[in-house]
């Protein structure tokens, strides 16, 4: 017996209760590929997430993070708090970079200043919490 489900396009599911006819996905659900036996629940962008792309019958919703947060993980699976430049996020919140380190972004960790002397160069511009040192000529 031919499997009629393979004829069901994206946006539908193969309804075994209706002799394998293709039924439309219910509201707030989708199927991105043909031949599916069920639809998938749409992702809901709530809390620190905001909707970047609405769910449709053929594709899931896509989320971004609200202002003050940035995405982490595949498909923005998590939102992490932004810090100011010159800071890094710790378990206790945003903390200033220690002397000798910098962070020029609102995310990520503080990194050590470049050691100019390793390349036989001198420091042309001193580093700050927000900026790396600038090495001058040797």
């Amino acid at each position: 017996l031919q499997d009629l489900c393979s004829n069901c396009p994206a946006g539908t599911f193969c309804d075994n209760n209706r002799s394998q006819i293709c039924s439309p996905c219910p509201p707030n659900s989708f199927s991105s590929a043909g031949g599916q036996r069920t639809c998938d629940i749409c992702r809901q962008c709530k809390g620190v997430f905001k909707t970047r792309k609405e769910c449709s019958s053929t594709s899931n919703a896509e989320c971004d993070c609200i202002s003050g947060y940035h995405c982490l993980g595949a498909e923005c699976s998590m939102c992490e708090q932004d810090c100011k430049q010159g800071q890094e996020l710790t378990k206790k919140g945003c903390k200033d970079c220690c002397f000798g380190t910098f962070n020029d972004q609102k995310r990520g960790i503080c990194r050590p200043w470049t050691n100019c002397s390793l390349d036989g160069k001198s420091v042309l511009v001193n580093g700050t919490k927000e900026r790396d040192v600038v090495c001058g000529p040797s």
């Epitope: 599911f13 309804d15 209760n17 039924s23 996905c25 219910p26 509201p27 707030n28 659900s29 036996r37 069920t38 639809c39 998938d40 629940i41």
Partner: nanobody
Framework: EVQLLESGGGLVQPGGSLRLSCAAS????????VGWVRQAPGKGLEWVSA????????YYAESVKGRFTISRDNAKNTLYLQMSSLRAEDTAVYYC???????????????RGQGTQVTVSS
Amino acid sequence: EVQLLESGGGLVQPGGSLRLSCAASGFTVSAEDVGWVRQAPGKGLEWVSAILDKGGSTYYAESVKGRFTISRDNAKNTLYLQMSSLRAEDTAVYYCARIVYHAGGGVTFDTRGQGTQVTVSS
């Protein structure tokens, strides 16, 4: 056993109104996501309207927004679809539907009734 019994269809002129009813048994309308699908002659099923999130939100197809209103009477365990400003393209068999959420995240729906015919014609 889940049963859905639709009524209220009929022949109506363009611009007219109808109210469809769906008497449910075997489950509680107020505790489920429920709605209406329709099948026009020679066409596939189409979602018309639904009450979602246990009543927290409603869905309307673009083609019926502002003309159709979905509601329910918890005491009577009945779902309604108030249809106004009806058009020829609303002609279809209307089915009451219960959205089913499966373990593992899948979503389908059940239509157990025979449906009710709505014909919009002058």
